[in-house]
């Protein structure tokens, strides 16, 4: 095997926002760094066969299978996939290696299978085998992280039982409110499972894998904050762990914290306390209440008390299964062409929802914001004043919710006309839906003022295009109007629009729009 070439097989994953992929089969532009697929000689095979490591690809991903051949002289090649021959154009890189590429755009089931590459060099012939399969993401899961106390240590472990194994990170913030947004400079991220610094203002744990990112906030009552008018509410499902942190700061150590559930002190083993001095020598105490696996009877008011602070409570509600509470009645809106407007849905849900806004078969990202009263809100403002039907869809592990909105844009009608041998029709999408008039233009009525009432048939909202109503009016042709110009006019409270049609014998009809 002295004269066997040195072969390298690589996989290049392309970022899917990369519109350049596929413009040139040789050089897709933006990509991840190549992944070495090994390419080992297959033993006991007739002829020289190299086998690359199996490739698993996500649905819709774009990849390049690439072979680098270090052999003297020219090479020729041929790809074979499912008994079809595919064109192959080798080129040479800067190190004078032969490079052969196969680009697979937007991977589908039909593109999965064995790709055979036959290479002929001056010295020898050989075959390279790639096996490409679609990654079975049905087996993938991404579960919301939960907390556990670390054995014999005052620390929390963050756990997310997900496949593939997720990367776990703590997201910490020490300021209040808006400044704790994900990308704020006040936010610190720690890519580790165990957290010892538990005194921060806002503590979240996030887990991410191929399916996305899920986070859980450590539910906190801060006794130094003024008691809210609405009690914070925490939902959990039976069997989930409960963690509530009570935090208080005082000028000295002369205070203690206690947890009560429905006026009864929590049992030993269901809480632990930590204290520290802050930089200005004030004392910070935190007291955790926890239940490793909640049951229905853990529902109730959990009250954290201190001799030096107003006590505060949270209502913990244990449910059998998740829910999404919101009004699903459809809503209709009518706005002006330049009016600022957002759709909004207010809901209470557990576990947290995943949601989308859809218009005209196109999905838009959905953001949700928590309100003080335990509700969340999702707004959609990116409608670009396009009338039609907008759909909000939300789901979590246990529930689904859909709400329909109709957006009407107030505008003057625009008229389109079409004609056949027997009739003329006019269409308009103005809003409010227009009324119609037909007028005949003749020597007696050069300004087209002679109204036509016979043979007119109006249909309001006969065609719904993604929720956008279209009104039409049809004039049946009679001998009395054949050969004349007629004018159809649509009018509503915002104005009038007309189009003139020449009713001659069959053939193309000229239309004269006249607004």
């Amino acid at each position: 095997n002295q004269d066997l070439p040195v072969i390298k097989c690589v996989l290049i994953n392309h970022k899917n926002n990369d519109s350049s992929v596929g413009k040139s089969s040789s050089y897709p532009m933006v990509s991840e760094s190549p992944e070495d697929l090994g390419c080992a000689l297959r033993p006991q095979s007739s002829g020289t066969v190299y086998e690359a490591a199996a490739v698993e690809v996500d649905v819709s991903a774009s990849i390049t299978l690439q072979v680098l051949v270090d052999a003297p002289g020219n090479i020729s090649c041929l790809w074979v996939f499912k008994h079809s021959s595919l064109n192959c154009q080798p080129h040479f890189d800067l190190q004078n290696r032969g490079v052969v590429s196969m680009v697979i755009l937007k991977m589908t089931e039909t593109q999965a299978g064995e790709y055979l590459l036959f290479i002929q060099s001056e010295a020898t012939n050989y075959t390279i085998l790639f096996t490409v399969s679609i990654r079975n993401t049905l087996l993938y899961t991404l579960r919301r992280p939960y907390f556990r106390k670390m054995e014999n240590q005052d620390a929390l472990v963050c756990i997310s039982e997900s496949v593939p194994e997720p990367i776990v990170e703590w997201v910490l913030c020490d300021s209040q409110g808006e400044s704790c947004k994900e990308e704020s400079p006040a936010v610190v991220k720690k890519e580790e499972k165990v957290l010892h610094e538990l005194f921060g203002t806002d503590i979240r744990c996030c887990a991410r894998n191929e399916l996305g990112r899920e986070c859980t906030r450590l539910f906190t009552i801060d006794l130094n904050q003024t008691p809210q008018t609405t009690l914070p509410q925490l939902f959990l499902k039976v069997g989930e762990p409960l963690w509530i942190r009570c935090k208080a700061v005082h000028v000295n150590h002369g205070f203690g914290l206690t947890w009560e559930l429905e006026n009864k002190a929590l049992e030993e083993g269901n809480y632990f306390e930590m204290s520290t001095y802050s930089t200005n020598r004030t004392m910070i105490r935190i007291l955790f209440a926890f239940v490793s696996s909640v049951a229905r009877n853990d529902t109730g008011y959990y009250t954290c008390s201190s001799s030096k602070h107003p006590s505060q409570s949270a209502l913990v509600t244990i449910v059998e299964k998740g829910f999404i509470n919101a009004t699903n009645s459809s809503e209709d809106y009518e706005i002006d062409q330049y009016e600022e407007f957002c759709f909004s849905v207010r809901f209470k849900a557990y576990p947290q929802i995943r949601c989308t806004w859809t218009f005209s078969r196109k999905s838009f990202p959905c953001e949700q914001k928590g309100l003080d009263n335990g509700y969340s809100i999702s707004k959609f403002c990116n409608h670009k004043h396009q009338p039609g039907e907008y759909i909000f869809h939300a789901e979590n592990d246990d529930a689904q919710f859909t709400k329909m909105f109709t957006l009407n844009i107030r505008r003057k009608p625009q008229v389109l006309a079409e004609a056949s041998a027997s009739q003329a029709s006019c269409f308009s999408d103005g809003y409010p839906l227009p009324s119609w008039t037909w007028k005949k233009c003749s020597d007696k009525s050069p300004n087209c003022t002679e109204e036509i009432t016979e043979g007119v048939w109006n249909r309001k909202a006969n065609r719904k295009v993604f929720g956008q109503w279209v009104s039409s009016s049809t004039l049946n042709m009679s001998e009395a109007i054949k050969g004349f110009l007629v004018k159809c006019c649509a009018y509503n409270s915002l104005g009038t629009s007309c189009e003139t049609i020449l009713l001659n014998s069959p053939g193309p009809f000229p239309f004269i729009q006249d607004n």
Epitope: L231, E260, N263, S305, S307, S313, L315
Partner: nanobody, 111 residues
Amino acid sequence: QVQLQESGGGLVQAGGSLRLSCAASGSTSSRNYIDWYRQAPGKQREWVAQITSGGNTHYEPSLKGRFTISRDNAKNTAYLQMNSLKPEDTAVYYCRILDYWGQGTQVTVSS
């Protein structure tokens, strides 16, 4: 369920005093803490004072010294003694236990 009923509000001149009562009934307990809140016309509801089950008291800092909260566990009633009243104390006063609220009692301070 807990029911709360405030009383003792009324019209008083600036500098005067009033004593509000909050009577609790239903499944309440002397171990519950009690809060007083108030809401002036066109403003958000704000916290005034709290008495804990052990009798510890806490006040909105700007009201400390003029207002005093107390409780009588035998009668299941909390009180808010308001002295040196000012026109800006005009509001509806509410008591709260956990997530339960009373209907409120109107306090009007005239100048």
